[in-house]
């Protein structure tokens, strides 16, 4: 792992100047785990749609990694497995929560943040502009 | 509305044994506004594998309004408009962090926690298991 | 149904403050934002400042940065604005807009103002 | 901060008319764009958000297009209730900002 050194200009989490802060506590609790196991899937490649998934790494965040889908045609792949290009393949976005360390490399004070993702690919029909 | 009492037992903020705790900056920063301008899609009704958007509330998380999709359909729509059973339509999942109340109605005090959403549907190529 | 209730007119001196409430119905008011809008006489909307109730932070238009407070008390779904050093150029209609506050999810996120109150007519003059 | 510009500033129409109100941003801004009606002495009211999207009890006739920096509000076969005041409001960044208002009256 990257070793990250401690920000001397660290925050002191009783610092009652600290902006808008609270308390967090990261010992993630999964919801996932009884009711949904998360099977590896293999949609990315089985799709008419299908996607590569591009590791997106930054030690400052959390999560650090986030994988991100990029459609890999810009069309769709027809049942005999070539592209028709008379569909389009287009990603589906989701706005995500993180935490940045804030100030960075700071190990105890974090700040939120919205990020936009790819999460995967989906076959459209197009939208045909006509020219009048 | 609901009228949410606030929790007497809600842990200090300077509490040293809140477990794995850290500080953290709630004036949520937007980094998609700079790069990426969010443009909104009816790809959920334009998509071979369509889906319908549920709304899932909780009060007690953040963000406490997510939108869940249901894939409509088991097949997927094909050149002609109806139903194609030799593909599958399955959601897209993603595993998410939100922050919840911990204890409940406690306005300072969190536990982060991830859960899996369907963002959207894919279309795919079912997996068939030949009988020997 | 949601309804966003507003406190009376108020009449103030230059230099004084004023508090307008703001108090919801219907909804789970933690889930949603409040922001403040303002219209003068025969002008158009102008944006103040709004909050994020759950975690009961605020933003605010740099004009009104340092002026204005805007606070919310989950325990009787009301939220507040606070001006203070007002002159005759704050006499105004002040609103409460309810904002969804929802994450973008390819199709929209809800950040527009669904609900408004029926506004606080705020005069000031000595 | 984003400058919203609409025209016409005002516009005087005949009732079962076609209204069109552009609404134009200083600066992309997706479709974080909405549409509000204000009426004399009341509160303004969601007509479409994201540039495109219908309220539930807003009349089908009002519809909204655009994404970036154009955008534009159709009223399709005006009616006499639709006299008022129309602003376009973008959310894309902080501070929210909306159009100067355009003022829409029946002949």
């Known amino acids: 792992g990257i070793t990250i050194p401690r920000n001397p200009g660290c925050p002191n989490s009783e610092d009652k100047n600290f902006p808008r802060t609270v308390m967090v506590n990261l010992n993630i609790h999964n919801r996932n785990t009884n009711t949904n196991p998360k099977r590896s899937s293999d949609y990315y490649n089985r799709s008419t749609s299908p996607w590569n998934l591009h590791r997106n790494e930054d030690p400052e965040r959390y999560p650090s990694v986030i994988w991100e889908a990029k459609c890999r045609h810009l069309g769709c792949i027809n049942a005999d497995g070539n592209v028709d290009y008379h569909m389009n393949s287009v990603p589906i976005q989701q706005e995500i929560l993180v935490l940045r360390r804030e100030p960075p490399h700071c190990p105890n004070s974090f700040r939120l943040e919205k990020i936009l993702v790819s999460v995967g690919c989906t076959c459209v029909t197009p939208i045909v502009h006509h020219v009048a | 509305g609901i009228t949410i009492p606030r929790n007497p037992g809600c842990p200090n903020s300077e509490d040293k044994n809140f477990p794995r705790t850290v500080m953290v900056n709630l004036n949520i920063h937007n980094r998609n506004t700079n790069t990426n301008p969010k443009r909104s899609s009816d790809y959920y009704n334009r998509s071979t594998s369509p889906w319908n958007l549920h709304r899932n509330e909780d009060p007690e998380r953040y963000p406490s309004v997510i939108w869940e999709a249901k894939c409509r359909h088991l097949g997927c729509i094909n050149a002609d408009g109806n139903v194609d059973y030799h593909m599958n339509s399955v959601p897209i999942q993603q595993e998410i962090l939100v922050l919840r109340r911990e204890p409940p109605h406690c306005p300072n005090s969190f536990r982060l926690e991830k859960i899996l959403v369907s963002v959207g549907c894919t279309c795919v190529t079912p997996i068939v298991h030949h009988v020997a | 149904e949601v309804q966003l209730v507003q406190s009376g007119a108020e009449v103030k001196k230059p230099g004084e403050s004023v508090k307008i409430s703001c108090k919801a119905s219907g909804g789970s008011f933690s889930s949603y934002g409040i922001s403040w809008v303002r219209q003068a006489p025969g002008q158009g909307l102008e944006w103040m400042g709004g909050i994020t109730v759950f975690f009961g932070t605020a933003d605010y238009a740099q004009k009104f940065q340092g002026r204005v407070t805007i606070t919310a008390d989950e325990s009787t779904t009301t939220a507040y604005m606070e001006l203070s050093g007002l002159t005759s150029d704050d006499t105004a209609v002040y609103y409460c807009a309810r904002v969804p506050n929802e994450f973008w999810n390819g199709y929209y996120a809800t950040q527009d103002f669904d609900y408004w109150g029926q506004g606080t007519t705020v005069t000031v003059s000595s | 901060e984003i400058v919203l510009t609409q025209s016409p500033d005002f516009q005087s129409v005949t009732p079962k008319e076609k209204v069109t109100i552009t609404c134009r941003a200083s600066?992309?801004?997706?479709?974080?764009l909405h549409w509000y009606q204000q009426k004399p002495d009341q509160s303004p009211k969601l007509l479409i958000k994201y540039a495109s999207h219908s309220i539930s009890g807003v009349p089908s006739r009002f519809s909204g297009s655009g994404s970036g920096t154009d955008f534009t509000l159709t009223i399709n076969s005006l009616e006499a209730e639709d006299a008022g005041t129309y602003y376009c409001h973008q959310s894309y960044w902080l501070p929210n900002t909306f159009g100067q208002g355009t003022k829409v009256d029946i002949k």
């Open positions: 600066q992309d801004i997706g479709s974080e």
